[in-house]
Interface confidence: low
């Protein structure tokens, strides 16, 4: 790959609709992986500490942004469908990792973000209490 | 897959408030709805794809629009794709 | 950058104990999830325990009932209590933290265990 190239993803983890869980009594977390080049990423979902395959669903593959550029960045969506009750509860602990590859291990992002939401290399939520 | 009971909405998630991206998440749409691309490149949304709740035996469909426009709305957002009238959920103001 | 650095290693009689400890160099706040993991020679390395935000645990198989997997915020430590030692448990014992910020995910480079009469 040219190295001058590579561009690490931003990864933000969306909180569930309040729309959604009234409506479904089910919540969906979305997380994004945008403004990669390679598109070399593998996504993951981890809750409480353990990675978890059920509830998830995540691109195929990822999305060009700029369809017509044939150096586009690259975007990358998942989504985490959980219980409202799971969600509600404010002891869980929902993360989005992305692993990004052609990265030198001494970059990093460290910008400070209000919880529940954090944006950094990979992302997290906490479940919310309701108000 | 079929979907049992197909009951398709668009929601608006929210971001860290720092955030300048706006996501827009259609969902529990029947498999026969197709999801277009946008024709506008500022707005970008993803094929459909299946999610399985294995511990509720619950599968559904979903796609995810997303943009950083200031004037980007879910309402609009997969104008493209024929979808009911009634499906967009407005988020109600959060108190906490 | 996290350095995590492994210690407690060493050799035991089957149905011996042995604690392992892994230091982070780094404040404990900014770190998700440690785990410890083993490769045992010719073999895959592999999960042994977890423990992550809110000191939620998890074990292997093989290590539940026996293992116990702890944490030191104070000390940026995290440690493995290893009971009941089997042949089985040679290995090296590797730590590994999940970070906040890149690269995000960390290894120690490995204390070895050896159970042998």
């Known amino acids: 790959e040219d190295l001058k190239k590579v561009f690490p993803p931003k990864v933000a983890v969306f909180e569930p609709s309040e729309a959604e869980i009234s409506h479904t009594q089910k919540a969906t977390l979305v997380c994004l992986a945008t403004g990669f080049y390679p598109d070399h990423v593998e996504l993951s979902w981890w809750v409480n500490g353990k990675e978890v395959h059920s509830g998830v669903s995540t691109d195929p593959q990822p999305l060009k942004e700029q369809p017509a550029l044939e150096d586009s960045r690259y975007s990358l969506s998942s989504r985490l469908r959980v219980s409202a009750t799971f969600w509600h509860n404010p002891r869980n602990h929902f993360r989005c990792q992305v692993q990004f590859y052609g990265l030198s291990e001494d970059d990093e992002w460290t910008e400070d973000r209000d919880k529940p939401i954090t944006q950094k290399i990979s992302a997290e939520a906490w479940g919310r209490a309701d108000c | 897959p079929y979907i049992q009971n197909p009951d398709p909405a668009v929601y608006q998630l929210r971001g860290s408030k720092s955030n300048d991206t706006s996501v827009c998440l259609f969902t529990d749409f029947d498999s026969v709805m197709n999801v277009s691309q946008s024709k506008d490149s500022d707005v970008h949304i993803t094929d459909k794809t299946v999610l399985d709740m294995r511990s509720m035996d619950f599968k559904s469909n979903g796609a995810v629009a997303w943009s950083n426009k200031s004037d980007f709305a879910c309402t609009s957002a997969f104008k493209d794709s024929v979808i009911p009238a009634d499906t967009f959920f407005p988020s109600p103001e959060s108190s906490c | 950058e996290v350095q995590l650095v492994e210690s407690g290693g060493g050799v035991v009689q089957p149905g011996g104990s042995l604690r392992l400890s892994c230091v982070a160099s780094?404040?404990?706040?900014?770190?998700?999830?440690y785990g410890w993991y083993r490769q045992a020679p010719g073999k895959e390395r592999e999960k042994v325990a977890h423990i992550s935000i809110g000191d939620q645990t998890d074990y292997a198989d093989s290590a539940k009932g026996r293992f116990t997997i702890s944490r030191d915020e104070s000390k940026n430590t995290v440690y493995l209590q290893m009971n009941s030692l089997r042949p089985e448990d040679t290995a090296l014992y590797y730590c590994?933290?999940?970070?906040?910020?890149?690269?995000?995910?960390?290894w120690g480079q490995g204390t070895l265990v050896t159970v042998s009469s």
């Open positions: 590994r933290a999940l970070s906040r910020i890149w690269p995000y995910d960390y």
């Open positions: 780094w404040e404990v706040h900014k770190i998700n999830f």
